[in-house]
C-alpha cells in the first residue's frame, strides 16, 4: 500500500465511522495509498441512502481522499410484509425493524392455520426477515379444511334441508348446466369432469357461487374461474372413468363459517370409507318432486360393496365395465336416497373421526336414469385415487 512520491500531500487520517473499522491501519496515508471500511456484523455500508457492498478510498495527489467516508448503519429489514389472512406482531418493541429485532406472524384463528414454520422471524445481518428454519419467504396461512356445523355424520334424492355452516365447501357452478363442486384450499374447486367439460376452453364462462344455501339467492360470494383442468384420462361420451376436474379461481376467497374448504383424504382415509360407512352428499339437484332444489339439500348414504355395484350396472342398458376401480358407489338397496341431475361435481364427504374433520371421498358422477331407484346406486369418482393428480396441478399452478 505504500507508494513514495515526492511533493504530494498526505491525506487526512481516516477516522472509522461508528460501528466500522479502517483497514489497513497506517501511520500516514500518501498518494495512491488506500483504505477500506468494514462494518460490524449487523451494520451495512451506506453512502447516503444507497447501499455499498464494499468501500475503498484512494489518496489523491491534492491530499484528499477520492471518496467521502461512508456510514456503517444498522441493518434495517424494514416493515415486514403483510401476511394474507394473518397478522404480524412486533416482539422486540413497537415498530422495531433493525438487526436482531424479532417479529411474530400468526394466522386468523379458527379458519386458518400456519404452514411452513412457527411464524417467528428475526432481522438478520443480510437485511432480510428470516425464520428459525432460515426461510426468507413469508409463512402461509392455509385455510382450515373440513369444518362443519354438522358434528356427525344429493344427486340429492330423499334428502333434508341443509342449515348454515353444514356444507361450507359447497360450490354452485352455473354456465351451461347447473352443477356443483367443493372448495379446496381458498382458490380451487374440485368437481366432475363431465360437469365442466363444455367450458374447458372458456373457463371465464363459469359462474361460481359459494357461501349460500339458496340456489336462487342474490346473497352469495361470487368467484370466477381462471382455468379448468380436466383429467387427461377422461373421455367425454365414453363412460365416466376419471370423471374429475379442478377449477382454479382467479382470486382467493375469504374463509368464514359459511365458506370453508373440504379436506382431501389422508392415506388412512379408506378406513372411514368401507362398505356401509356413511357418507353425505349435498346439492341443489333434482328432488323427489322432479325439480331442482331451491334450498341446499343433503342425504346420508352408505357405501355399497364395489362388486355389488359393478354387478348392478353390468346389465343393459349399461355397457360392461361401466363401474371401474376409480369409482365408488353409495346408496340404499331399497332406493329412495340418492344424488341426482344437478348435483354433479358435488362432494360425497366423510367424517375422519381421528382428525374430526370432513374430507371428500367421492365426487357425484353418474347413476341410473331414475334417481333413487331400488337396486341401483349413485356412482362417485373415488377421490383417493387422484391425490397425486390433484396435488401436482395445485402445486404447478
Amino acid at each position: 500500500h505504500h507508494h513514495h512520491h515526492h511533493a504530494s500531500q498526505p491525506c487526512p487520517y481516516p477516522m472509522a465511522p461508528p460501528n466500522g473499522h479502517v483497514s489497513p491501519v497506517q501511520a500516514k496515508y500518501i498518494l495512491k495509498d488506500s483504505f477500506s471500511i468494514f462494518c460490524e456484523t449487523g451494520y451495512e455500508l451506506l453512502q447516503g441512502h444507497l447501499p455499498l457492498k464494499s468501500f475503498t478510498a484512494v489518496c489523491q495527489k491534492d491530499g484528499s481522499w477520492d471518496r467521502p467516508m461512508p456510514a456503517c448503519s444498522i441493518v434495517d429489514c424494514g416493515p415486514p410484509d403483510d401476511l394474507p389472512s394473518g397478522r404480524v406482531e412486533y416482539i422486540t418493541g413497537p415498530g422495531v425493524t433493525t438487526y436482531k429485532a424479532v417479529i411474530q406472524y400468526s394466522c386468523e384463528e379458527t379458519f386458518y392455520t400456519m404452514k411452513v414454520n412457527d411464524g417467528k422471524y428475526v432481522c438478520e445481518a443480510d437485511g432480510f426477515w428470516t425464520s428459525s428454519k432460515g426461510e426468507k419467504s413469508l409463512p402461509v396461512c392455509e385455510p382450515v379444511c373440513g369444518l362443519s356445523a354438522r358434528t356427525t355424520g344429493g344427486r340429492i334424492y330423499g334428502g333434508q334441508k341443509a342449515k348454515p355452516g353444514d356444507f361450507p365447501w359447497q360450490v354452485l357452478i352455473l354456465g351451461g348446466t347447473t352443477a356443483a363442486g367443493a372448495l379446496l384450499y381458498d382458490n380451487w374447486v374440485l368437481t366432475a369432469a363431465h360437469a365442466v367439460y363444455e367450458q374447458k376452453h372458456d373457463a371465464s364462462a363459469l359462474d361460481i357461487r359459494m357461501g349460500t344455501l339458496k340456489r336462487l339467492s342474490p346473497h352469495y360470494t361470487q368467484a370466477w374461474s381462471e382455468a379448468v383442468f380436466i383429467h387427461e384420462g377422461y373421455t367425454h361420451d365414453a363412460g365416466f372413468d376419471n370423471d374429475i376436474a379442478l377449477i382454479k379461481l382467479n382470486n382467493k376467497v375469504v374463509i368464514n363459517s359459511n365458506i370453508t374448504p373440504i379436506c382431501l383424504p389422508r392415506k388412512e382415509a379408506e378406513s372411514f370409507m368401507r362398505t356401509d360407512d356413511i357418507g353425505t352428499a349435498s346439492g341443489w339437484g333434482l328432488t323427489q318432486r322432479g325439480f331442482l332444489a331451491r334450498n341446499l339439500m343433503y342425504v346420508d348414504i352408505p357405501i355399497v360393496d364395489h362388486q355389488k355395484c359393478t354387478a348392478a350396472y353390468e346389465k343393459p342398458p349399461y355397457p360392461r365395465g361401466s363401474v371401474t376401480a376409480n369409482m365408488l358407489c353409495a346408496g340404499l338397496e331399497s332406493g329412495g336416497k340418492d344424488s341426482c341431475r344437478g348435483d354433479a361435481g358435488g362432494a360425497l364427504v366423510f367424517l375422519d373421526s381421528e382428525t374430526e374433520r370432513w374430507f371428500v371421498g367421492g365426487i357425484v358422477s353418474w347413476g341410473s336414469m331414475n334417481c333413487g331407484e331400488a337396486g341401483q346406486y349413485g356412482v362417485y369418482t373415488k377421490v383417493i385415487n387422484y391425490i397425486p393428480w390433484i396435488e401436482n396441478i395445485i402445486s404447478d399452478f
Epitope: 447516503g48 441512502h49 444507497l50 447501499p51 455499498l52 457492498k53 477520492d66 471518496r67 437485511g127
Partner: antibody, heavy 118, light 108 residues
Framework: DVQLQESGPGLVRPSQSLSLTCTVT?????????WNWIRQFPGNKLEWMGY???????SYNPSLKSRLSITRDTSKNQFFLQLNSVSSADTATYYC???????????WGQGTTLTVSS | QTVLTQSPAIMSASLGERVTMTCTAS???????LLWYQQKPGSSPKLWIY???KLASGVPVRFSGSGSGTSYSLTISSMEADDAATYYC?????????FGAGTKLELK
C-alpha cells in the same frame, strides 16, 4: 464497459400491470451497488421509483410503494419493475440506472417509453 | 421528503458568458450526496458533477459545482454552444431520492 438496457411493452391499458426488464452487461448486479428505476414524465420531471441492491434488498419511493415491486434474476443479470394498477399518470420514459455513490460510476439505460391508454 | 428547487427554470446565455444555476434543498443535504446531471433531448441523463464539486470524466473544466447544507450551485465559467441542455440536481442523502425540476439552459 457497463451497459443497461430497458425493455417493455410500450403500451399498457389502464388498471393493468406494467412489467419492465433491465438487462445489465459488463457488471454483475450482485457485485455491488443499488440498481434503480427512474422515470421521466412528459413534462421532463424525473422521479426515483426504487432500487434493488446487490444483496437483493429493495427500497421504494413511498408514493409508489403500494403498487411497485422490484425483483431480479441473478442468473440472467436482469432486474425487473412491476407497477400495478397503472393509469395515464404513469405514462413516462422509464430508465434503469446505477447512481453514482460519490464516485464517477454512473450508468443509465437508453430508456423505454411507456404509454398508458385504452 | 427532501424537495429540491432549481432556479431559474429556463435561462439563456451568450457564448462566453458566465452562467450560474442553483439547487435549494428543503432540508440539509450532505455535500457528498448531491449530484448534477446534464440531459439533452432524446438522450438519457449523464452524470456531470458528483459530491457537489467533482467533475465526472469527460466534463470540461469550465464547469464547477459548489455548496453545502441546503444551497448548491452549478457554474459554467464561459458558455459554449455544446452546454445548451437541461441540468438536474439529485440528492441521495435520504429516502426517497429526489430530483430538482431542472434548469433549461439555452444559447442566446
Amino acid at each position: 464497459d457497463v451497459q443497461l438496457q430497458e425493455s417493455g411493452p410500450g403500451l399498457v391499458r389502464p388498471s393493468q400491470s406494467l412489467s419492465l426488464t433491465c438487462t445489465v452487461t459488463g457488471y454483475s448486479i450482485t457485485s455491488d451497488y443499488a440498481w434503480n428505476w427512474i422515470r421521466q414524465f412528459p413534462g421532463n420531471k424525473l422521479e426515483w421509483m426504487g432500487y434493488i441492491s446487490y444483496s437483493g434488498r429493495t427500497s421504494y419511493n413511498p408514493s409508489l410503494k403500494s403498487r411497485l415491486s422490484i425483483t431480479r434474476d441473478t442468473s440472467k443479470n436482469q432486474f425487473f419493475l412491476q407497477l400495478n394498477s397503472v393509469s395515464s399518470a404513469d405514462t413516462a420514459t422509464y430508465y434503469c440506472a446505477i447512481i453514482s455513490t460519490a464516485v464517477d460510476f454512473d450508468y443509465w439505460g437508453q430508456g423505454t417509453t411507456l404509454t398508458v391508454s385504452s | 421528503q427532501t424537495v429540491l428547487t432549481q432556479s431559474p427554470a429556463i435561462m439563456s446565455a451568450s457564448l462566453g458568458e458566465r452562467v450560474t444555476m442553483t439547487c435549494t434543498a428543503s432540508s440539509s443535504v450532505s455535500s457528498s450526496y448531491l449530484l448534477w446531471y446534464q440531459q439533452k433531448p432524446g438522450s438519457s441523463p449523464k452524470l456531470w458533477i458528483y459530491s457537489t464539486s467533482k467533475l465526472a470524466s469527460g466534463v470540461p473544466v469550465r464547469f464547477s459545482g459548489s455548496g453545502s447544507g441546503t444551497s448548491y450551485s452549478l457554474t459554467i465559467s464561459s458558455m459554449e454552444a455544446d452546454d445548451a441542455a437541461t441540468y438536474y440536481c439529485l440528492q441521495y442523502n435520504r429516502s426517497p431520492l429526489t430530483f430538482g425540476a431542472g434548469t433549461k439552459l439555452e444559447l442566446k
